[in-house]
């Protein structure tokens, strides 16, 4: 009697199942009690000797490529051996690599967590994922795993993490880069500083007083509000960041406390109050203002 090994499918793709069948074309296995065993190269597969002429392999990988055969043993201990069958496992090259961010859109608050998710639409086997920072890439990390996605995490984002990023996936057919993704780090405004600027050391009535408010940190655009005794004087915008100024033509009623507020949509901060007082110097004809 002759024995044949049949693999289905005969040219499997990585990750897919394969059924090995030990066939006896001129003998019904029911005619006699047989035990079957399947081998790859020199190693027995699965449970070893079994009454089933089939062996199901759940997932085949590139390293499972090799020479397979089976043996059948009768109750009388006669052993039949099949010819060797070469099974080549086909690896699918990585394709369509993409990089996505969590949170989506690449906008993240300073101090928050950022995850860069590298994905491939196709690709089998062990895939090496690499993450790069900057258009001229600085390698951040690499991971090798048997999955179509991998993650790189920045637990607490800093201002210096605002950059372009990309990832690369590779499974033996050459590296394939994703497109670029830009990360914007959103920074809440710091407490602003209010400065009063007058054309002379002692400002007089009718002089123009400049109120300059500046938050040293914070993502633009920043909106500044100016206050006199908690009454709103007006607002100014700094579209590219930096400070903003508000001009005031002085009258005697302008004595008192001044403050400003900075707001960039990520939170508002109020400055310390600055006090302006009118003083009447001895022999002077006009009132003067000091701060």
């Amino acid at each position: 009697a002759e024995l044949f090994l049949i693999a289905s499918p005969s040219h499997p793709t990585e990750g897919s199942p394969v059924t090995l069948t030990c066939k006896m074309p001129f003998l019904q296995s029911s005619d006699a009690q047989f035990q079957f065993c399947f081998f790859r190269d020199t190693r027995a597969l699965g449970p070893g000797w079994s009454s089933s002429p089939k062996l199901q392999i759940a997932a085949m990988w590139k390293e499972d490529t090799g020479s397979y055969w089976c043996e059948a043993q009768t109750m009388a201990s006669k052993v039949l051996r099949s010819r060797r069958s070469q099974i080549n496992v086909h690896r699918v090259p990585v394709a369509d690599v993409s990089l996505e961010t969590q949170p989506p859109g690449g906008q993240v608050m300073e101090g928050d967590r950022l995850v860069l998710i590298c994905s491939v639409a196709m690709g089998t086997g062990d895939i090496t994922f690499l993450w790069y920072k900057g258009a001229v890439g600085l390698n951040l990390q690499s991971k090798t795993q048997r999955s179509l996605t991998a993650e790189y995490e920045i637990p607490s984002v800093r201002e210096s993490d605002a950059e372009q990023y990309y990832c690369v996936a590779e499974n033996g057919y050459g590296p394939s880069p994703s497109g670029l993704v830009s990360i914007t780090v959103r920074i809440p405004v710091s407490r602003p500083i209010l400065m009063l600027r007058a054309p002379r050391a002692q400002a007089a009535v009718e002089d123009v007083l400049e109120l300059h408010c500046e938050a040293l940190r914070g993502s633009p655009p920043i909106l500044y509000w100016f206050y006199h005794e908690d009454i709103t004087l007006g607002s100014r915008s700094a579209p590219s960041g930096g400070g903003a100024s508000f001009n005031l033509s002085l009258t005697e009623e302008h004595s008192g406390n001044y403050s400003c507020e900075a707001n960039n949509g990520l939170g508002a901060q109020r400055s310390e109050a600055v006090t302006l007082n009118f003083t009447v110097p001895t022999g002077a004809r006009s009132n003067h203002l000091t701060s």
Epitope: Y132, G179, L180, S182
Partner: antibody
Framework: QVQLVQSGAELVKPGASVKVSCKAS????????IHWVKQAPGQGLEWIGW????????KYNEKFKGKTTLTADKSTSTAYMELSSLRSEDTAVYFC????????????WGQGTLVTVSS | DIVMTQSPLSLPVTLGEPASISCRSS???????????LEWYLQKPGQSPQLLIY???NRFSGVPDRFSGSGSGTDFTLKISRVEAEDVGVYYC?????????FGQGTKVEIK
Amino acid sequence: QVQLVQSGAELVKPGASVKVSCKASGYTFTSYNIHWVKQAPGQGLEWIGWIYPGDGNPKYNEKFKGKTTLTADKSTSTAYMELSSLRSEDTAVYFCARRIHYYDYFDYWGQGTLVTVSS
Amino acid sequence: DIVMTQSPLSLPVTLGEPASISCRSSQSIVHSNGNTYLEWYLQKPGQSPQLLIYKVSNRFSGVPDRFSGSGSGTDFTLKISRVEAEDVGVYYCFQGSHVPWTFGQGTKVEIK
């Protein structure tokens, strides 16, 4: 197939401004940086800077800061370079080029736009 | 700024003969990530530049194997093993390691 098609030649007066366009097709516009390069008549090549179309963020060669403004419009897959306060020394052919990250090279170039500054 | 100096500036060649262009940078162009971003471009008359070599010695797809690049640190060379008529034009070296990125002044290759 990938193409970068630039706007036509411009003749402009000194002190004026000009905006050169570079329309990309055949690939995802927001996936790669677009660079600009200057070539004065009979001269070599000078790198001006790049723009990332994904967020419109430019990076300039210090020499061209104030002279050049780089922008991009994602909706039309077009990059722009605006030259201001034009002088005779700005007369040149200006190229846009796509740069591939990781491999790091300029793989596709526009055909070039001649800007002539003359009164 | 890094200055890229090419020599010679003009190179008359004989068809079928080898040719060599040198490019020297005013300081090392090894990037902090360990790569050397040195490229060679050819600009044929009336055309845009086209890539020949990237990262010192890697030939771009479709570039004939008669072109080869070598070098390290500050000294780099482009070699053409056998010059063909289609190789005429101006050759530029380029460094993309340190901003501002800079080109060499160009080497004009023409047939004798």
